[in-house]
Interface confidence: medium
Amino acid sequence: MEEGGDFDNYYGADNQSECEYTDWKSSGALIPAIYMLVFLLGTTGNGLVLWTVFRSSREKRRSADIFIASLAVADLTFVVTLPLWATYTYRDYDWPFGTFFCKLSSYLIFVNMYASVFCLTGLSFDRYLAIVRPVANARLRLRVSGAVATAVLWVLAALLAMPVMVLRTTGDLENTTKVQCYMDYSMVATVSSEWAWEVGLGVSSTTVGFVVPFTIMLTCYFFIAQTIAGHFRKERIEGLRKRRRLLSIIVVLVVTFALCWMPYHLVKTLYMLGSLLHWPCDFDLFLMNIFPYCTCISYVNSCLNPFLYAFFDPRFRQACTSMLCCGQSRCAGTSHSSSGEKSASYSSGHSQGPGPNMGKGGEQMHEKSIPYSQETLVVD
């Protein structure tokens, strides 16, 4: 329209009016029910993981155990906030818990996201060192897999999630009866730059919390795969008749994390790209409507790991069985065998067979033929 032109015929409907956004309708109790289920399974499952890790003797713990424990701690601290989010969603986005819990529970979501992905990166790198460079990096692994690496990843996760703690607030928007828990950029941005802040934080969280860690992990697994492939070509081991899947639990953890968080990051990225590429309104609306479900799927990841351990790792299953019947006299005899292998210690899935240097079925396993057997997950 011309600068001095009359805009009498202009009815006020802006370009976005074709994009007729409406209040997002939650699917009743579906999302709150999933949140409560994740809370129940997550607290018991991750509590069990921590119990089995810390119950084992120090000597039995391997370098990866600290990452497994950290992963469980991250998930556990997050899932305890899920009843709050379930209530919020069920009340059609009315937050009754005050600003402190709005900030804290929002913060824990992102701390969990960062800490989890960093733990998986740590596990992957640990496996890389154990398999690709077992001798050269023995000392490095002792140092890296210790308290320093864990402290660094937690500090990093805590710092990266800090904008959420600062910017989250509760607001009685429009002075209606409902109070929302939302990101308020007004303290750091002008109205015109709020979107830039939202995009900036969104892109950085996806980059640092997903893209970069997964690039590192894929690189680690590429070299691991090369090493394992070369190893199987060169050697035939009596104890590995069925070519047991090495590293399966960590690979499954990583793949599960990727599958759970991919929709969240993908939809978020596509939505942000929409401001540049101007998606059709229907697609924009589709992204807005599926995002809560993508968020829900990402939260589900926090209760899955214990089930993955239970499914893929006999050692963890044994630890669980031990705990379930530890108070019963009939189990007293089975909880400790002469070899010490039935102590129900959960060594992050580093199965060493039924006994020291034993393959499946108890057959003798020569360590020289697979030097990293002590440190690698060997699962049927």
Epitope: A13, D14, Y21, T22, D23, D92, Q180, Y182
Partner: antibody
Amino acid sequence: EVQLVESGGGLVQPGGSLRLSCVASGFTFNNYWMSWVRQAPGKGLEWVANIKQDGSERYYVDSVKGRFTISRGDAKNSLYLQMKSLRAEDTAVYFCARDRFGYSFYDKGVRYYYGMDVWGQGTTVTVSS
Amino acid sequence: DIQMTQSPSSLSASVGDRVTITCRASQGIRNDLGWYQQRPGKAPKRLIYAASSLQTGVPSRFSGSGSGTEFTLTISGLQPDDFATYYCLQHNSYPRTFGQGTKVEIR
């Protein structure tokens, strides 16, 4: 063309009732909040009431609470204002307007009001004995 | 209720002039404010929303600024079409309230 057309205005005695209608066209009516705004002769604008898409939320200015009822008939693309116990001070031109909201992508339940972007031409209500 | 005080209530200006209208809120309303133009006998039109965002199709000579309690509408280079009454509207809380209006007249 996006359009709102009001009707139902007229002369009514104090204490009487009147029902205003507003028919929407050119947009998906049931996707929007809608408002009524009035303007007394020679005076400024006064927001009267608004209603959510599904009718689950309705807000009124204090001076009309208990007397006016805002409602909508999505099948007919219509907005209504039922006015009872009318007073002389209710004399005004009544405009219906479309409310424009932005919605937070991250924080569901959070909406940002962007004002009334489409207005009708108004219907005149005169309360006089 | 939040009171909106507009100043001046009327002003005289010439074509090409720069005009500034102020709106004060009785309490902080963040950026929850819009500006409307109304010509005699016509329906109001939205010019600015969210304090500073220009409505699509509105000439760029109109601009809005402010946050909290003080807001301004600026018309840089007044055109003949711009002689009208301007209202601010707060939508931070219910009931929504308009300023009393500023009438811009030809000098």
